[in-house]
Structures are given as C-alpha cells and as structure tokens.
Interface confidence: low
C-alpha cells in the first residue's frame, strides 16, 4: 500500500517517500524504487539553509557597497551572508537590503539618541535653556552659558539655536 504521509526529512513523490536533501545541497533527481534521492552541493556563493527539495540553491545576498552595505558575516553553503551598513549608515529594514545615511539634527534640535547600524538618529527640540547651532548627527543640545557664574549679565537672550550673549555688569558711578 503506497504511503500517504512520510517521516520527517522525507517527501512524498510518485507514491513513495524520498529523502530531502540536507542543508547545503540541492535536489538533482527524486528517488526511485531503485535509487535514493540524488543531491548535489551548492556552488560557491550559493546556499540552502533547510532540508529541502529545491532544484536551485539560493545566491548569497550581495552586500552591495553601492547601497552602503558591507558583509557582517560571510555566507556558507548552509547559511546566507549577513549584511550590515557602513559606518554612518543604517539599514532601511530588518532584512538590511539597503542603507540610508544617518540623518543630522538641524539647528534648534539636538541628538536624543545616536544612530546605530539598524536605527536612525533620534532628534529632539532644544528646550528652553538649551541650544544647538549646528546640523549634526552627534551633538546634543547645549545649555546656555551661565552669565552669573562668570560675574556677567545677559546682554542678548538665547534661543533654541543660539547661546546667550554675556556682557559686563553696568557699574554704578
């Protein structure tokens, strides 16, 4: 009686159970009543990461430097290449198929969280008492200069983009 289901690591074909090809190998011929499944190893820069009946191995992911990618972990016949982004870039998705440059925080905004290989810069508006006068992917908001501690007075108020301007106190004559 022909089987209707097969054991783990087997597949049903032509009313018989054939062995799947092991990771790193692809299917060339199904088994017959006389022969076992015929499998061949994946070529260079190819892989298959499961027990399978694939007739083609998958190409290793290409970490294209034109897209800002570099190899984090080289692929094998059983694993895909893992890409990450060049310094200063981060992945656009979990699969890291392309990268975008870290954004800079504009004047008036400071860096709340510095970008990583997988997340962009997080900016925050500079609150009262703080400023940022540069466009930067690293700089936080800086506190206004404290004129009092320098025995000076505020001559020009600070903004979220400019520091206060200190000056000498008027001397009473």
């Amino acid at each position: 009686e022909p089987p209707t289901a097969c054991r783990e690591k087997q597949y049903l074909i032509n009313s018989q159970c054939c062995s799947l090809c092991q990771p790193g190998q692809k299917l060339v011929s199904d088994c017959t009543e006389f022969t076992e499944t015929e499998c061949l190893p994946c070529g260079e820069s190819e892989f298959l990461d499961t027990w399978n009946r694939e007739t083609h191995c998958h190409q290793h992911k290409y970490c294209d430097p034109n897209l800002g990618l570099r190899v984090q972990q080289k692929g094998t016949s059983e694993t895909d290449t893992i890409c990450t982004c060049e310094e200063g870039w981060h992945c656009t998705s979990e699969a890291c198929e392309s990268c975008v440059l870290h954004r800079s925080c504009s004047p008036g905004f400071g860096v709340k969280q510095i970008a990583t290989g997988v997340s962009d810069t997080i900016c925050e508006p500079c609150p009262v008492g703080f400023f940022s006068n540069v466009s930067s992917a690293f700089e936080k908001c800086h506190p206004w200069t404290s004129c009092e501690t320098k025995d000076l007075v505020v001559q020009q108020a600070g903004t979220n983009k400019t520091d206060v301007v200190c000056g000498p106190q008027d001397r009473l004559r």
Partner: antibody, heavy 115, light 111 residues
Framework: QVQLVQSGAEVKKPGSSVKVSCKAS????????ISWVRQAPGQGLEWMGM????????SYAQKFQGRVTMTRDTSTSTVYMELSSLRPEDTAVYYC????????WGQGTLVTVSS | QSALTQPPSASGSPGQSVTISCTGT?????????VSWYQQHPGNAPKLIIY???KRPSGIPDRFSASKSGNTASLTVSGLQADDEADYYC??????????FGGGTKLTVLG
C-alpha cells in the same frame, strides 16, 4: 562582472519624449541601484537620478524633477529612463551606471533634439 | 544642486605628478566620505578610478591616489604616462539620495 548595454541613438523633435533602455547582465539585477548620467557635447557629466530595481524606488535630481521618469522591468533585467518635453539643450549622451558609485557604465546613448 | 568646482585644465610631463582639486561644500564633499573620481578618454564612457575618497577599484594602478580635507577632495596622478591624458571628474554624495559631479578637468601630458 555586471554589464550594462544601452539602446541605440535617437533623434527627437523639441517637445517630444525619449525613452532610453539599459539592460543588465551578470550579477543579481535587484541587488544594485542604477544611476543615469548625461553629457552634453563638449560638456561635463550631469547626474540625473537613480532607480533601485529591487523595489523600483527612484530619486531624481531637482533639475529633472517632473520631466524624467525611471522605471524597471525585472523580467528582462532592464531599466528605462524617459525624458519628456525635450528641448535642443537636452542633446547629450545618456549613460546608465551601476550604483551611486557608478563603478560600471553602459556604452552611452546619443539623443539628438532638433527640429 | 551646484556642481563641484574643478580646475578646467592641468598638465605635467611624463614621470611627474599632478594634483587635481575638487571643491564642494559642507553639504556634499565636506559632509560625506563618498567622493569618487572618474577618468574619461574621448569617445568613451567614464571609468571609476577612486571611490569612498581614497579607495581604488582592483585593476587601477596605485599611481592614482586621492584624499580629502574639509570641503575639498584631491586626486593625484604620479609617474604621469601618455595614456593618463584624459578628462577627470569628481563626484560626491550630496544627501537625499542625490549625487553631484564636478565640472571636469582636462589633463594634458606634455611632450
């Protein structure tokens, strides 16, 4: 080694459109962006924009925004650049090149705009 | 996007060195280490000779070297040869998925 082969020369009338193709072979089509660059006779290189074949996302230079359209056909590993409302000053050799770094170039397509 | 500024011409005798500058702004050359240089012989497509400021694609001789300081990138061709006579273009990433080229420099090998 990626090879980029472009379509042949075109002569167009002012006000019309031109569509230049760039067929890629060798390497995985969806794993690299394609830039388009033009060069007017005796002039320098001018970056027009790019298309990422994997998702079809595009980015165009401000100068060409609204006049250029870049598309791709993954079944034939071909990208296209269409430029509309042609004027005589669009007469140039149009190149496709691989990625932002433009490490591989097509042979170029001469587009002549003349009445 | 304004073009990067290159000298229109440069020259040198065989065996000498010549340096070509490429000046941009703090939004392009100064902002990113993504400067490339191309060599173009008459009637041919450009050819990448330097990328990421100073890296050479395999097959490009080490007579070609490059660097960057502030908003200016430089290409140096040493041990000049007759075949180095060509147009040279710089390009830089300019943010927002845009590239910008220099106006080009015609390099003449004297003699």
């Amino acid at each position: 080694q990626v090879q980029l082969v472009q379509s042949g020369a075109e002569v167009k009338k002012p006000g019309s459109s031109v569509k230049v193709s760039c067929k890629a072979s060798g390497g995985t089509f969806s794993s690299y962006a394609i830039s388009w660059v033009r060069q007017a006779p005796g002039q320098g290189l001018e970056w027009m924009g790019m298309i990422n074949p994997s998702g079809g996302t595009t980015s165009y230079a401000q100068k060409f925004q609204g006049r250029v359209t870049m598309t791709r056909d993954t079944s034939t590993s071909t990208v296209y650049m269409e430029l509309s409302s042609l004027r005589p000053e669009d007469t140039a050799v149009y190149y496709c090149a691989r990625g932002f770094r433009m490490d591989q170039w097509g042979q170029g397509t001469l587009v002549t705009v003349s009445s | 996007q304004s073009a990067l500024t290159q000298p229109p011409s440069a020259s040198g005798s065989p065996g000498q060195s010549v340096t070509i500058s490429c000046t941009g702004t703090s939004s392009d050359v100064g902002a990113y280490n993504f400067v490339s240089w191309y060599q173009q012989h008459p009637g041919n497509a450009p050819k990448l000779i330097i990328y990421d400021v100073r890296k050479r694609p395999s097959g490009i001789p080490d007579r070609f070297s490059a660097s960057k300081s502030g908003n200016t990138a430089s290409l140096t061709v040493s041990g000049l040869q007759a075949d180095d006579e060509a147009d040279y273009y710089c390009s830089s990433y300019a943010g927002n998925n845009e590239m910008v080229f220099g106006g080009g420099t015609k390099l003449t090998v004297l003699g």
